[in-house]
């Protein structure tokens, strides 16, 4: 005998209390597939979450993050505070990158400037809190009299971070 519940379309549920009649999902709930015995509660976008797509009887609500936050996790399950470029997020809030480090994103952490000398090159453009240094030709490649900017830069060997 075929289960009559399989005839219930998305947006309804098979109501066992009413002889397996297909009943519409109650307000603030949905069923995205047919044949379901219950409807799922709609996701609510509260606090740092904002509604990207309203819930309907056949699909869940979709959230993203309010301005100043970015999404993490599948379907934006988490919101993390943005910082400015040149900063990183700590528990005490956004902090400027230490000298010799940079962050070119509004999220994430600061990382050290490239040490051009490890590749036998010189610094063509100084690093900032927001940008890495730009390495140029090796000092030996420069024509006589030409100068290159070489500020002190922390070593950037794998496994060593600025302290």
């Amino acid at each position: 005998i075929q289960d009559s519940c399989s005839n219930c379309p998305a947006g309804t549920f098979c109501d066992n209390n009413r002889s397996q009649i297909c009943s519409p999902c109650p307000p603030n709930s949905f069923s995205s597939a047919g044949g379901q015995r219950t409807c799922d509660i709609c996701r609510q976008c509260k606090g740092v979450f904002r509604t990207r797509k309203e819930c309907s009887s056949t699909s869940n609500a979709e959230c993203d993050c309010i301005s100043g936050f970015h999404c993490l996790g599948a379907g934006c399950t988490m919101c993390e505070q943005d910082c400015k470029q040149g900063q990183e997020l700590t528990k005490k809030g956004c902090k400027d990158c230490c000298f010799g480090t940079f962050n070119d994103q509004k999220r994430g952490i600061c990382r050290p400037w490239t040490n051009c000398s490890l590749d036998g090159k010189s610094v063509l453009v100084n690093g900032t809190k927001e940008r890495d240094v730009v390495c140029g030709p090796s000092p030996a490649d420069l024509s006589p009299g030409a100068s290159s900017v070489t500020p002190p830069a922390p070593a950037r060997e794998p496994g060593h971070s600025p302290q």
Epitope: L72, T77, K91, G108, Q163
Partner: antibody, heavy 116, light 109 residues
């Protein structure tokens, strides 16, 4: 959608080398840190190190410094974990995960078995 | 590096409250995160940044963090909550992530 897909299980002998991979898709691979996490049989999670694929900057846990090498090829959205000489004690499940503090996406894990 | 210590196991009756501690020097100065891992699966975030619950994680999960202890609390524990739980923190000294040793939560009955 965001996915991290790891290479398949490996069975190796002590002293052999190995490189396992983690391919990211569905997001800007270059601009998110990738971490590697070890889980030995029946044991807990251990953070090994991380890489920023945009410029391949790496940072290791002191426990794993010099024991493994983490690398990435941003052109193919793939991070790697490699050993030059495996030991029996390297037998474990290895996960890649997106992030440096909050790990919001994880690979399915690569089981590495080292046995003579 | 900071070391995070968790009890190896915690048992709780269904419907009761489970508390899992994670202790480490001044962990309250850093964000603590909590992961749930079920057998054969990758870990999943259940609490991030001390007390925030990802959407899709039941309201019975909550977290706190101050001084030397972070705590994961599961109110009205259900059988499906049986799993291993790990705390973690990112430390700006050494720029490393550290996991606690993990706690096996057993739901009795």
């Amino acid at each position: 959608q965001v996915q991290l897909v790891q290479s398949g299980a490996e069975v190796k002998k002590p002293g052999e080398s190995l490189k396992i991979s983690c391919k990211g898709s569905g997001y800007s691979f270059s601009t998110y840190w990738i971490s590697w996490v070890r889980q030995m049989p029946g044991k807990g999670l251990e953070w090994m190190g991380k890489i920023y694929p945009g410029d391949s900057y790496t940072n290791y846990s002191p426990s794993f410094q010099g024991q493994v090498t983490i690398s990435a090829d941003k052109s193919i959205s793939t991070a790697y974990l490699q050993w030059s000489s495996l030991k029996a004690s390297d037998t474990a499940m290895y996960y890649c995960a997106r992030g440096y503090g909050i790990f919001d996406y994880w690979g399915q894990g690569t089981l590495v078995t080292v046995s003579s | 590096d900071i070391e995070l210590t968790q009890p190896p196991s915690v048992s709780v009756a269904p419907g009761q409250t489970a508390r899992i501690s994670c202790s480490g020097d001044n962990i309250g100065d850093q964000y603590a995160h909590w992961y749930q891992q079920k057998p054969g699966q990758a870990p999943v975030v259940v609490i991030y940044q001390d007390k925030n619950r990802p959407s899709g994680i039941p309201e019975r999960f909550s977290g706190s963090n101050s001084g030397n202890t972070a705590t994961l609390t599961i109110s009205g524990t259900q059988a499906e909550d049986e799993a291993d739980y790990y705390c973690s923190t990112y430390t700006f000294v050494g720029f490393t992530t550290v996991f606690g040793g993990g706690t096996k939560l057993t739901v009795l009955g």
